[in-house]
């Protein structure tokens, strides 16, 4: 009979969900790398597809500074980024599938700490929820690594050398080569967070030029060779 069918249907009714957030206790990553901070949630609003805002903050729940915020229009999986601190944070999860997982690029030691995810339903079902315990991000130091070394043409038929290294703490760079005292001529500039670049502005002699990167965790070096052939300036690296 009809009531029997209806009872059978009701037996398959979705269990009433309540607000909850699932985050791991800790995420570990090395400086210079990227990390994913997982965060999934359940909510009591069945299949909500109204406007929503996803927020991540650091330090403490509810009051800590926001590092990321995005908003999705009704029915949309596209969460438009409104805030991404230093442009290094982006939503990896699908908020419509209750996933607020966040990717953090170019990690620095200073990024270590607790992060808290929050979701806000801003439509008819006006409601919000934030993780209380958060996920602890541990960024570990990284030994130096030289990522690029090159010789480039400079002014007045001269040549200059560039060396870019990464590490955390940021490594100190030094050039050495065939010209006496040329290491003191290296111009060192801070790059993006964990990357640094040093320039040797004028390569006056042929030979081997070595870039050394060092921090408290170790050192790395790489070399480039300059040979100017008779008849026309040129390099061999």
């Amino acid at each position: 009979d009809a009531s029997g069918d209806l009872l059978n249907t009701e037996a398959h009714s979705a269990p009433a969900q309540r607000w909850s957030m699932q985050v791991p206790a800790e995420v570990n990553a090395e400086a210079g790398d990227a990390a994913v901070l997982p965060c999934t949630f359940t909510h009591p609003h069945r299949h909500y597809d109204g406007p929503l805002t996803a927020i991540w903050r650091s330090g403490e729940p509810y009051a800590g500074p926001q590092v990321f915020r995005c908003t999705a229009a009704p029915g949309s999986e596209l969460c438009q980024t409104a805030l991404s601190l230093h442009g290094r944070f982006r939503l990896l999860g699908n908020p419509r599938r209750n996933d607020l997982s966040l990717r953090v690029e170019r990690l620095a030691l200073a990024d270590s700490g607790r992060y808290f995810c929050r979701v806000e339903f801003t439509g008819d079902a006006h409601d919000r929820y934030e993780s209380r315990h958060g996920v602890r991000l541990r960024v570990t130091a990284a030994a130096p690594r030289i990522v690029n070394i090159s010789v480039l043409p400079g002014p007045a038929h001269a040549f200059r050398a560039l060396c870019t290294a990464e590490g955390e703490p940021p490594p100190a760079l030094a050039w050495s080569g065939p010209a006496p005292g040329n290491s003191s001529a290296a111009l060192q500039g801070q790059g993006h967070g964990y990357q640094v670049t040093a320039e040797l502005p004028a390569l006056t002699r042929d030979g081997r030029y070595t870039c050394t990167a060092a921090n408290s965790l170790g050192r790395a070096e790489a070399s480039v060779y300059l040979f100017r052939f008779h008849g026309a300036p040129g390099t061999s690296t």
């Epitope: 249907t9 398959h12 009714s13 299949h47 009704p74 029915g75 999986e77 596209l78 599938r97």
Partner: antibody, heavy 120, light 106 residues
Framework: EVQLQQSGAELVRPGASVKLSCTAS????????MHWVKERPEQGLEWIGR????????EYDPKFQGKATMTADTSSNTAYLQFSSLTSEDTAVYYC?????????????WGQGTLVTVSA | QIILTQSPAIMSASPGEKVTMTCSAS?????MHWYQQKPGTSPKRWIF???KLASGVPGRFIGSGSGTSYSLTISTMEAEDAATYYC?????????FGGGTKLEIK
């Protein structure tokens, strides 16, 4: 087991209306959106719209606004799609689809489809 | 509305061959979803959230892409993969499908 059982094929005259049904078993339709999708051989798949059977909230593709009417009856666990002022362009297979079990992807379960043929 | 353009419309591949089909969106999307349909049957969800395989989908299927450009790749074609594949977006109402890529076996 989750299933969507759609009503049988329809042969209708131009200008007439048709009402298709989709009865769900294995879950309660009020807990999930029900969608309707149109399939024509050369046009592929088109999303018509979705209904929230619990409160009747509806979202249509503007292309089908005024042409399609979605309703649902939670007591019989059935969703309906009514098409009006039929033309040859409405000749297609119509699927009802649910987002049940959306953790594993949208449009989890599809009905077997109902073929609607509009012909004089 | 976001228009999804799939290419090629029809393609054929030999068993063991690598197959790639693309889906281009007229506006940026966060994710792309893919469905497989064989003649006379209802579509099946195949790949969701751009790269996640639906339950039962073989690991030779790979979804990738971002923004406006997405692709579905089959690392080694098998006879059972012959079907029509549709991409689908939910980044803006109205939700839309691509026109489909029909993959045939040589």
């Amino acid at each position: 087991e989750v299933q969507l059982q759609q009503s049988g094929a329809e042969l209708v005259r131009p200008g007439a209306s048709v009402k298709l049904s989709c009865t769900a078993s294995g879950f309660n339709i009020k807990d999930y959106y029900m969608h309707w999708v149109k399939e024509r051989p050369e046009q592929g798949l088109e999303w018509i719209g979705r209904i929230d059977p619990e409160d009747g909230d509806i979202e249509y593709d503007p292309k089908f606004q005024g042409k399609a009417t979605m309703t649902a009856d939670t007591s019989s666990n059935t969703a309906y799609l009514q098409f009006s002022s039929l033309t040859s362009e409405d000749t297609a297979v119509y699927y009802c689809v649910t987002d049940y079990d959306y953790d594993g992807g949208w449009f989890a379960y599809w009905g077997q489809g109902t073929l609607v043929t509009v012909s004089a | 509305q976001i228009i999804l353009t799939q290419s090629p419309a029809i393609m054929s591949a030999s068993p063991g061959e690598k197959v790639t089909m693309t889906c281009s969106a007229s506006s940026s999307t966060s994710f792309m979803h893919w469905y497989q349909q064989k003649p006379g049957t209802s579509p099946k969800r195949w790949i969701f959230d751009t790269s996640k395989l639906a339950s039962g989908v073989p690991g030779r299927f790979i979804g990738s892409g971002s923004g406006t450009s997405y692709s579905l790749t089959i690392s080694t074609m098998e006879a059972e993969d012959a079907a029509t594949y549709y991409c689908h977006q939910r980044s803006a109402y109205p939700w839309t499908f691509g026109g489909g890529t029909k993959l045939e076996i040589k």
